[in-house]
């Protein structure tokens, strides 16, 4: 099948750089690199770094790639987040904060913008900034199903931590089915696990966004770390070549 | 890097043909075919062919096998079970059966017979008859710790099924905790979800092996399927071979 | 994907699962696995194009990334992508063993 | 495992994870990623000995399988085991963007 | 080409379970989710539920304590599965591949309730 | 849950006129954000499956005649066959997607 020869590193260098020069172009689907007549000057905007760098951290509870990937998760997701909808809204009082469990709500509107169709929809992280814990906790989340009822979706075990630190859960297959759905405002609740027989149910963890009596900067501080779901999704304009390239090769 | 020949697809055939003969030997660590002197003339005994069959059939709960694998995962893995220890064994009175949880106890002597060294454990499974359910339940396996403390391990949700239908909980890192430990018998509690604010919290799964009342041939029947461990073990003789030959090439 | 679906009901030319089963007795001479009889083997067959050079027109290029080198590689090559398990009877002495052996059995392909 | 813990700090013939750091102004000539300014790509490289003949001594060739040819290819390839994402920053028009890229990061290799 | 072919029992008895398999050809169940749509004889078009490539379920409020969508990606089927089943369920019941919308439909499967 | 009522239910046109035909939606299937409405025309001719026409209320899917617009915005919208032929002998569906998927009762198209 092949007749091996001395290897060329040099050579094997720059046919490897080329192909990602490919690579790049591709999975953005650019068949150019995009001109920078418009870019404006100066630095990146902050909520810009700051959802990069949420991309670049892998968090507690996030698996890494898995392979094999479907087709269409060859081509680059764009990456967008949508904050949970602050806690003074009214949608917060229907719902007593109560010593077991905490609440988060999301714009339904705000999640449609960023991801138009459901199908777009590669990969929905809820993200959590938990505040140092000072003993194991055992949690749940939970997502807001019709009327009052919940339906359970996964848990994590939280060891002990004198540092903050991010959380994530998977949670595409909710947003997918918030995309369907249409309704304005969509919610998940996290618990302390209840076993049948056990008395003590406090939520002990700490979620950044919901602490009481913060007041100024710290409280604004506070707010922007308030969980959020970090969402990647094949923009439309990308996805509209697939809609109509649909046929094998 | 390579010069390409026209393919010979009956070349390609016969190559991978032989090296599947190697890998087959090599997975095993046999340096030619096992003799046939010995075997016993006769089909295959029952047991050894449920064995097969269990080891063959995916079930509910069970992944895929993940890739990649580590390195020891190359090596064939003997696969043995060892079946719950039987209801009516005193360990059991100690555990009254509420409505919320059912218990398996194993014995530890038999986990040891199959798999001598902790280290030797690839992969055990928990594998459940269910039989019909009427209505979705969640479930969560719980493993026993000191005393009369529970340690929380996974859960499963059970969609409503005409059918009876194995599960498999993944429990490798608790059967190898068992076996570093050296206690007599050790168990497992399977408990419905209970929420902190449900009150319904019924077992309402049905397992093959506790349905009381059974008599005669339906018993013995019922007993073959009772919960099992399906272990996956490197065999001790093939394990000594890692044991020189750990230093990379 | 170039899974058994695609792969066995077309006539890719392409990086592609090829059908290949094994009969222990016929293929390798063997008597001693007991079960199963052969399996499913297959195998990965098939050109992965390098398919970047300064001088190609890019967007004809671009679109074949996919399939014949997304990992864009100096020398892609065809490869398995999903492999499954084989488990396997056979004597040692009068014993009986069941044996499961990993990755044996290819699904599909991809150039890598 | 063929990682770059092993193959960076080794001077493995056979099939390696090999050290490549991509920057995209000097490397590629691009501007326009603003983020990250490269990045390490790595890539894979070396020989997996297709190691089986009817005449070849068993035993010795056996103990080899795992690493050169552990999926019983016809033609053993050396490709990317593990792979990580890569987020970048670009911007379009005047709208910035940050995207990922899936499979863009050797982390290891093996042969296939 | 994308080809989508239902396949059903034809007659079903009332309260008993409808099984149908659609078996697709052309594109990839891990990217592209499957609707179900039913049509009474003579009458409109009814969506019953659909399954995502990434096997996420979305059911009609008013089926979901009767009905399952699951699918085997491997071998490129989807099954609907409807229980407790009357007469008005009587229907040609459609497949479709399921992506910004239902763009591609098989041919239906027709099935009558009735003892 | 959204409401389709489509009008007429039937009408009957000789071959070569325009034709429109209506879909009112019980609430607003316009995304504002992103400008979309969440509206598809279907054609179904006797004894055949669905096909889809339109999406996102005016984009027409590829294949599809020229003959064929899409029109209307949040709760109103139009199908307009600008010179009807012989082969649109149909019954039509529009379908909301802004909140599940749900259709309408469908017009009957009968030629003259």
């Known amino acids: 099948l092949s007749t091996c020869k001395t290897i060329d590193m040099e050579l094997v260098k720059r046919k490897r750089i080329e192909a990602i020069r490919g690579q790049i172009l591709s999975k953005l689907r650019l068949a150019s690199p995009p001109s920078q007549g418009e870019v404006p000057p100066g630095p990146l905007p902050e909520a810009v770094l700051a959802l990069y760098n949420s991309t670049r951290d892998r968090v507690a509870g996030e698996s890494a790639e898995p392979e094999p990937e479907p087709e269409a998760d060859y081509y680059a997701k764009e990456v967008t987040r949508v904050l949970m909808v602050e806690t003074h809204n009214e949608i917060y009082d229907k719902f007593k904060q109560s010593t077991h469990s905490i609440y988060m709500f999301f714009n339904t509107s705000e999640l449609r913008e960023a991801v138009p169709e459901p199908v777009l929809l590669s990969r929905a992280e809820l993200r959590l900034l938990r505040l140092k814990l000072k003993v194991e906790q055992h949690v749940e989340l939970y997502q807001k199903y019709s009327n009052n009822s919940w339906r359970y979706l996964s848990n994590r075990l939280l060891a002990p931590s004198d540092s903050p630190e991010w959380l994530s859960f998977d949670v595409t297959g909710v947003v997918r089915q918030w995309l369907s759905r249409g309704g304005e405002i969509e919610g998940f609740r996290l618990s302390a696990h209840c076993s049948c027989d056990s008395r003590d149910n406090t939520l002990q963890v700490d979620i950044n966004g919901f602490t009481t009596g913060r007041r100024g900067d710290l409280a604004t501080i506070h707010g922007m770390n308030r969980p959020f779901l970090l969402l990647m999704a094949t923009p439309l304009e990308r996805a509209q070549h697939l809609q109509s390239s649909r046929h094998r090769r | 890097l390579s010069t390409c020949k026209t393919i010979d697809m009956e070349l390609v055939k016969r190559k991978r043909i032989e090296a599947i003969r190697g890998q087959i030997l090599s997975k095993l660590r046999l340096a030619s075919p096992p003799s046939q002197g010995e075997v016993p003339p006769g089909p295959l005994p029952e047991a050894v062919l449920a064995l097969y069959n269990s080891t063959r059939d995916r079930v509910a709960g069970e992944s895929a096998e993940p890739e990649p694998e580590p390195e020891a995962d190359y090596y064939a893995k003997e696969v043995t079970r060892v079946l719950m220890v039987e209801t009516h064994n005193e360990i059991y009175d100690k555990f009254k059966q509420s409505t919320h949880s059912i218990y398996m106890f194993f014995n530890t002597s038999e986990l040891r017979e199959a798999v001598p060294e902790p280290v030797l454990l690839s992969r055990a499974e928990l594998r459940l008859l269910r039989l019909k359910l009427k209505v979705e339940q969640h479930v969560e396996l719980y493993q026993k710790y000191s005393n009369n403390s529970w340690r929380y391990l996974s859960n499963r949700l059970l969609a409503p099924s005409d059918s009876p239908e194995w599960l498999s909980f993944d429990v490798t890192g608790v059967v190898r905790q068992w076996l570093s430990r050296g206690g007599e018998i050790e168990g497992f509690r399977l408990s419905a979800h209970c929420s902190c604010d449900s009150r319904d919290n019924t077992l309402q799964v049905d397992i093959n092996g506790f349905t009381t009342g059974r008599r005669g041939d339906l018993a013995t029947i019922h007993g073959m399927n009772r919960p099992f461990l399906l272990l996956m073990a490197t065999p001790l003789e093939r394990a000594q071979h890692l044991q020189s030959s750990r230093h990379r090439r | 994907a170039l899974d058994t679906n695609y792969c066995f009901s077309s006539t890719e030319k392409n990086c592609c699962v090829r059908q290949l089963y094994i009969d222990f007795r016929k293929d390798l001479g063997w008597k001693w696995i007991h079960e199963p009889k052969g399996y499913h083997a297959n195998f990965c067959l098939g050109p992965c194009p390098y398919i970047w050079s300064l001088d190609t027109q890019y967007s004809k290029v671009l679109a074949l990334y996919n399939q014949h080198n997304p990992g864009a590689s100096a020398a892609p090559c065809c490869v398995p992508q999903a492999l499954e398990p084989l488990p396997i009877v056979y004597y040692v002495g009068r014993k009986p063993k069941v044996e499961q052996l990993s990755n044996m059995i290819v699904r599909s392909c991809k150039c890598s | 495992a063929l990682d770059t813990n092993y193959c960076f700090s080794s001077t493995e013939k056979n099939c390696c994870v090999r050290q490549l750091y991509i920057d995209f102004r000097k490397d590629l000539g691009w501007k326009w990623i603003h983020e990250p300014k490269g990045y390490h790509a790595n890539f894979c490289l070396g020989p997996c000995p297709y190691i089986w003949s009817l005449d070849t001594q068993y035993s010795k060739v056996l103990a080899l399988y795992n690493q050169h040819n552990p999926g019983a290819s016809a033609a053993p390839c050396c490709v990317p085991q593990a792979l990580e994402p890569l987020p970048i920053v670009y911007y379009v028009g005047r709208k910035p963007k940050v995207e990922q890229l899936s499979n863009m990061i050797v982390r290891s290799c093996k042969c296939s | 080409e994308v080809k989508l072919q239902e396949s059903g029992p034809g007659l079903v008895a009332p309260s008993q379970s409808l099984s149908i398999t659609c078996t697709v050809s052309?594109?990839?169940?891990?990217?592209?989710?499957v609707s179900w749509v039913r049509q009474p004889p003579g009458k409109g078009l009814e969506w019953l539920g659909i399954i995502w490539g990434d096997g996420t379920t979305i059911y009609q409020s008013g089926l979901i304590s009767r009905l399952s969508i699951s699918k085997d990606d491997s071998k490129s089927q989807v099954f609907l599965k409807l229980s407790s089943l009357q007469t008005d369920d009587t229907a040609t019941y459609y497949c479709?591949?399921?992506?910004?919308?239902?763009?591609?439909w098989g041919q239906g499967t027709s099935v009558t309730v009735s003892s | 849950d959204i409401v389709l009522t489509q009008s007429p239910s039937s009408l009957a046109v000789s071959a070569g006129e325009k034709v429109t035909m209506n879909c009112k939606s019980s609430?607003?299937?316009?995304?504002?954000?992103?400008?979309?409405?969440?509206l598809a025309w279907y054609q179904q001719k006797p004894g055949q499956s669905p096909k889809l026409l339109i999406y996102w209320a005016s984009t027409r899917e590829s294949g599809v005649p020229d003959r064929f617009t899409g029109s209307g915005s949040g709760t109103d919208f139009t199908l307009t066959i600008s010179s009807v032929q012989a082969e649109d002998l149909a019954v039509y569906y529009c379908k909301q997607s802004y909140n599940l998927w749900t259709f309408g009762g469908g017009t009957k198209l009968e030629i003259k």
């Open positions: 052309g594109f990839s169940l891990t990217t592209y989710g």
């Open positions: 609430q607003s299937l316009l995304n504002s954000r992103i400008r979309k409405n969440y």
């Open positions: 479709a591949k399921h992506y910004f919308v239902m763009d591609y």
